[in-house]
Interface confidence: low
């Protein structure tokens, strides 16, 4: 529906609180280096303007698009050129090119200081002194570090953040109440950010068709009782929501997401029996709940797929008349029967089916040609099954930390050119697949593991895209979205890699390591492990294990010493010499 004033329309739909929060998120995701106070000032100016448009939609500039209004506002920032360099050139462009330009300058790894958590009493005082500013600051800090965070979901996180402080700041033991909640929000937030980043990469790098295919498969697994027409409608609406959020249209996105949740809840009977509880919740919780809802039970009497997609004499006719819809139906029918498959596996099967029909429908005897198409699926299904079985066995044998180390070594040997922090971050996340998925029964392992790995490998792809250093990473990331994981799995040791020069400084440690948390200490050790592999890519598992065991013993010994710094200096030299000898460096 056309509105005289888009900004007034969104302000009225969303309400002032959500409007201001979403504009703040949008601005922080675009100008990631700007101080908090500057963003708050811009948001207040936009909000005052929106109110004038609500009062009179015909007022000056109220008919302008949101991109024009927001872009004009961002381009008033005085230090744009000094802070952002060439991003300032975006302001010379007209819409829609200006918004595209801002989007291209979003930085997945901005050079921002790590968020340090203050003492609980300090946080509670800040919360009580000015709750509104405290919560805005949360939105700002998350949004600027995660420029693709799903904005309506960030509102949900902020609501939970507020609830945690409201409850815990009046508890007897504030820290015991608050810290676990903040840890949970942090971990869930990182996971949510990474999942959304994959959706945006899918839309931006592979197009709407790829995203729609993903959505058909996932929603068909989740709502197997829904008709194909119903799934089609949900897919179209969901695609619009994510296209908007990934494109920086956060007000439209949040508004449309609310409409979609409303539609789903009004039509539960024809969608899923699992939605009842979700639909009784308030808006933000409702949308989150729907997005995470468990798969409904499969209808009992689903016929064999072969009848419609292999045996029917109309296969080629149906395919020719509406290719994407026919493939969409195939994907829907296959996915609703296979909640035990990962979405990416279902998409590989659909791609194989499509390739077979393209070839066979042009053949002399099409039916003869595609009659055995389902046999081609067997190896595609078995490959992830076997990989998950092997890796879960390894995880159960080693535990999470050592499993991460095995993956660190594996991936450093595959792509040693990638920066050490990226290899550590990605391998640690890959390693978390064990504790996340291996506990599940067989029927849930593959969707859990392979779809999670897709999210983590996308992190590698977006970080690598910023500063490309490896042709192999570029190839796996860009050739096929659904084959990224098999592509990385298939990589062997990079024989072309010239080992890194040995630098003793890299392996010099100080007493500060003793005061680090267990997680931070692990990261230090894992960083050293990656560097070792970069120096000696042909080192065996046994050699690396021996050096890492020595290293762990060295840290433990020096952290117990009276004069820690002297111990690290002297014992460190001995460790480096011993390691060089052990590895033949």
């Amino acid at each position: 529906d056309a509105h005289k004033s888009e900004v007034a329309h969104r302000f009225k739909d969303l309400g002032e609180e959500n409007f201001k929060a979403l504009v703040l998120i949008a601005f922080a995701q675009y100008l990631q280096q700007c101080p908090f106070e500057d963003h708050v000032k811009l948001v207040n100016e936009v909000t005052e303007f929106a109110k004038t448009c609500v009062a009179d939609e015909s007022a000056e500039n109220c008919d302008k698009s949101l991109h024009t209004l927001f872009g004009d506002k961002l381009c008033t920032v005085a230090t744009l050129r000094e802070t952002y360099g060439e991003m300032a050139d975006c302001c010379a462009k007209q819409e829609p090119e200006r918004n595209e330009c801002f989007l291209q300058h979003k930085d997945d790894n901005p050079n921002l200081p790590r968020l340090v958590r203050p003492e609980v009493d300090v946080m509670c005082t800040a919360f009580h002194d000015n709750e509104e500013t405290f919560l805005k600051k949360y939105l700002y800090e998350i949004a600027r570090r995660h420029p693709y965070f799903y904005a309506p979901e960030l509102l949900f996180f902020a609501k939970r953040y507020k609830a945690a402080f409201t409850e815990c700041c009046q508890a007897a033991d504030k820290a015991a109440c608050l810290l676990p909640k903040l840890d949970e929000l942090r971990d869930e937030g990182k996971a949510s950010s990474a999942k959304q980043r994959l959706k945006c990469a899918s839309l931006q790098k592979f197009g709407e068709r790829a995203f729609k295919a993903w959505a058909v498969a996932r929603l068909s697994q989740r709502f197997p009782k829904a008709e194909f027409a119903e799934v089609s409608k949900l897919v179209t609406d969901l695609t619009k929501v994510h296209t908007e959020c990934c494109h920086g249209d956060l007000l439209e996105c949040a508004d449309d997401r609310a409409d979609l949740a409303k539609y789903i809840c009004e039509n539960q009977d024809s969608i899923s029996s699992k939605l009842k509880e979700c639909c009784e919740k308030p808006l933000l919780e409702k949308s989150h709940c729907i997005a995470e809802v468990e798969n409904d039970e499969m209808p009992a009497d689903l016929p064999s797929l072969a009848a419609d997609f292999v045996e029917s004499k109309d296969v080629c006719k149906n395919y020719a008349e509406a290719k994407d819809v026919f493939l969409g139906m195939f994907l829907y029918e296959y996915a609703r029967r296979h909640p035990d498959y990962s979405v990416v596996l279902l998409l590989r099967l659909a791609k194989t089916y499509e390739t077979t029909l393209e070839k066979c429908c042009a053949a002399a005897d099409p039916h003869e040609c595609y009659a055995k198409v389902f046999d081609e699926f067997k190896p595609l299904v078995e490959e992830p099954q076997n990989l998950i079985k092997q890796n879960c066995e390894l995880f159960e044998q080693l535990g999470e930390y050592k499993f991460q180390n095995a993956l660190l070594v594996r991936y450093t040997k595959k792509v040693p050119q990638v920066s050490t922090p990226t290899l550590v971050e990605v391998s640690r996340n890959l390693g978390k697949v064990g504790s996340k998925c291996c506990k599940h029964p067989e029927a849930k392992r593959m969707p859990c593991a392979e779809d999670y790995l897709s999210v983590v490998l996308n992190q590698l792809c977006v970080l690598h895209e910023k500063t490309p250093v490896s042709d192999r990473v570029t190839k796996c990331c860009t050739e096929s979205l659904v084959n990224r994981r098999p592509c990385f799995s298939a990589l062997e040791v990079d024989e072309t890699y010239v080992p890194k020069e040995f630098n003793a400084e890299t392996f010099t440690f100080h007493a500060d390591i003793c005061t680090l948390s267990e997680k931070e200490r692990q990261i230090k050790k894992q960083t050293a492990l990656v560097e070792l592999v970069k120096h000696k890519p042909k080192a065996t598992k046994e050699q690396l294990k021996a050096v890492m065991d020595d290293f762990a013993a060295f840290v433990e010994k020096c952290c117990k010493a009276d004069d820690k710094e002297t111990c690290f200096a002297e014992e460190g030299k001995k460790l480096v010499a011993a390691s060089q000898a052990a590895l033949g460096l």
Epitope: V216, F228, A229, E230, S232, T236, Y263, S270, A322, K323
Partner: nanobody, 115 residues
């Protein structure tokens, strides 16, 4: 490829009625939206009425109470019953059907309301 064909347009006096029909030919699965739009000379195309997969309907304010949209899923048909027609309803009426494969439009049928 999917094709839509509208019929039922024509010349009618103010206060009169017409029933527009639209049929989708070709293989079209998973229709989730069927709608009628119209375009008067020198104006933008505007939504008249739509019906979604769940059967819920939406009407432009100018036609509420006078026009009724309905569909026949089995026959891939959508209808627009237009009563109490006014000269302002004069336009080319277009049928629109959407599914996961895309958005399909008919060629249009002319409706003229004049005495």
């Amino acid at each position: 490829q999917v094709q839509l064909q509208e019929s039922g347009g024509g010349l009618v006096q103010p206060g009169g009625s017409l029933r527009l029909s639209c049929v989708a030919s070709g293989s079209i699965w998973g229709i989730y939206h069927m709608g009628w739009y119209r375009q008067a000379p020198g104006k933008q195309r505007e939504l008249v009425a739509s019906i979604t997969v769940d059967g819920s309907t939406h009407y432009a304010d100018t036609v509420k109470g006078r026009f009724t949209i309905s569909k026949d899923n089995a026959a891939n048909m959508v209808y627009l019953q237009m009563n109490a027609l006014e000269p302002e309803d004069t336009a080319v009426y277009y049928c629109d059907i959407r599914n996961v494969g895309g958005d399909y439009w008919g060629q249009g049928t002319q409706v003229t309301v004049s005495s």
